[in-house]
């Protein structure tokens, strides 16, 4: 069992063509975060936020991914193919690795709700 806890935006939905914020928050630990990785459902890396080197957005996502707010990630110009799981991986010392999961559903409907409630 890990010392800390990852809180995420949980299951969220957003409109096709719109944007969404993916957020994770690490709490209940004194460990220092050296890097946060953001991965897509197929385990491809979207972006990295390194404590020393700053943000790196992977080339395939440069047009549609924006860093922040904070350690979070903003996905823009959403397509139906963006539906799926997203993972934040916190690399910390001395605790090791923490991993959070978010499920994003992209909806065609104009009544798509963007739920951004935090849940553990």
């Amino acid at each position: 069992m890990m010392t800390g806890t990852i809180e995420t935006t949980g299951n969220i939905s957003a409109k096709k063509g719109g944007s969404v914020i993916l957020q994770c928050h690490l709490s209940s630990t004194m460990a220092q975060v050296t890097q946060v990785n953001w991965e897509q459902h197929d385990h491809s890396l979207l972006a990295i936020r390194n404590a020393e080197l700053g943000w790196h957005i992977y080339p395939a996502f440069k047009d549609r991914v924006a860093p922040g707010p904070g350690l979070g990630l903003t996905l823009q110009s959403l397509t139906m193919n963006d539906t799926g799981e997203y993972f934040c991986t916190y690399h910390t010392y001395p605790d090791g690795t923490y991993r959070g999961r978010i499920f994003l559903e992209v909806l065609e409907s104009s009544v798509a709700e963007h739920s951004a409630r935090f849940q553990i």
């Epitope: 890990m2 010392t3 220092q32 990295i48 020393e52 080197l53 001395p94 605790d95 090791g96």
Partner: antibody, heavy 122, light 107 residues
Framework: QLQLQESGPGLVKPAETLSLTCTVS??????????WTWIRQPPGKGLEWIGT???????FHNPSLKSRVTIPVDTSKNQFSLKLSSVTAADTAVYYC??????????????WGQGTLVTVSS | DIQMTQSPSSLSASVGDRVTITCRAS??????LNWYQQKPGKAPKLLIY???SLQSGVPSRFSGSGSGTDFTLTISSLQPEDFATYYC?????????FGGGTKVEIK
């Protein structure tokens, strides 16, 4: 098979800077999942953690060594180093480099170099 | 800093004996306790991590237990190659600290 190899002078004069290098083979020092560590052992005594570094340069060190420690990383050479300034005879020890293992919470030191003895003497 | 205290500091035992080494932390470290074996002139070798998990390749005669502040390393049947010094180490928080070691000698 991952291997770590320490190198550097075996004799350092008091008040000078001790410099050691750890070369990692069989794996990448740039791995996001690993941290890299220096540990020392004075002759006939126990183990002391010196400090730990991430590939990007984030460093954690033992407060007992105050600001004497720096741990640079050279990812192009797959190496990390130890620089300990203002050394005294009390810094005489076998110095080990080690990897902080992945995949478990609060990971241990799972791979170690063979160690190198550094003597501080004039 | 978290102090790690090992006992005994040394012990004499015979091949086939059951050997128990204890390690006590000055505050709770949950199960973040690791055990290492060191032979003269060699680097320490990881035996047990997370208090009770056996590192790959380590014989099953080695086992670990405990949580909180009190931990135990047990060698169920001492073999000739087990005569060495054993160290506990906490990976709960920095600074990382080790116990003073327990030297297991031949009786």
């Amino acid at each position: 098979q991952l291997q770590l190899q320490e190198s550097g002078p075996g004799l350092v004069k008091p008040a000078e800077t001790l410099s050691l290098t750890c070369t990692v083979s069989g794996g990448s020092i740039s791995s996001y999942d690993h941290y890299w560590t220096w540990i020392r052992q004075p002759p006939g005594k126990g183990l002391e953690w010196i400090g730990t570094v991430y590939y990007s340069g984030s460093t954690f060190h033992n407060p007992s060594l105050k600001s004497r420690v720096t741990i640079p990383v050279d990812t192009s050479k797959n190496q990390f180093s130890l620089k300990l300034s203002s050394v005294t005879a009390a810094d005489t020890a076998v110095y080990y480099c080690a990897r902080v293992g992945p995949d478990v919470s609060h990971p241990p030191f799972d791979y170690w170099g063979q160690g190198t003895l550094v003597t501080v003497s004039s | 800093d978290i102090q790690m205290t090992q006992s005994p500091s040394s012990l004499s035992a015979s091949v086939g004996d059951r050997v128990t080494i204890t390690c006590r932390a000055s505050q709770s470290i949950s199960s973040y306790l690791n055990w290492y074996q060191q032979k003269p002139g060699k680097a320490p070798k990881l035996l047990i991590y997370a208090a009770s998990s056996l590192q790959s390749g380590v014989p099953s005669r080695f086992s670990g237990s405990g949580s909180g502040t009190d931990f135990t390393l047990t060698i169920s049947s001492l073999q000739p190659e087990d005569f060495a010094t054993y160290y506990c180490q906490q990976s709960y928080s920095t600074p990382i600290t080790f116990g003073g070691g327990t030297k297991v000698e031949i009786k």
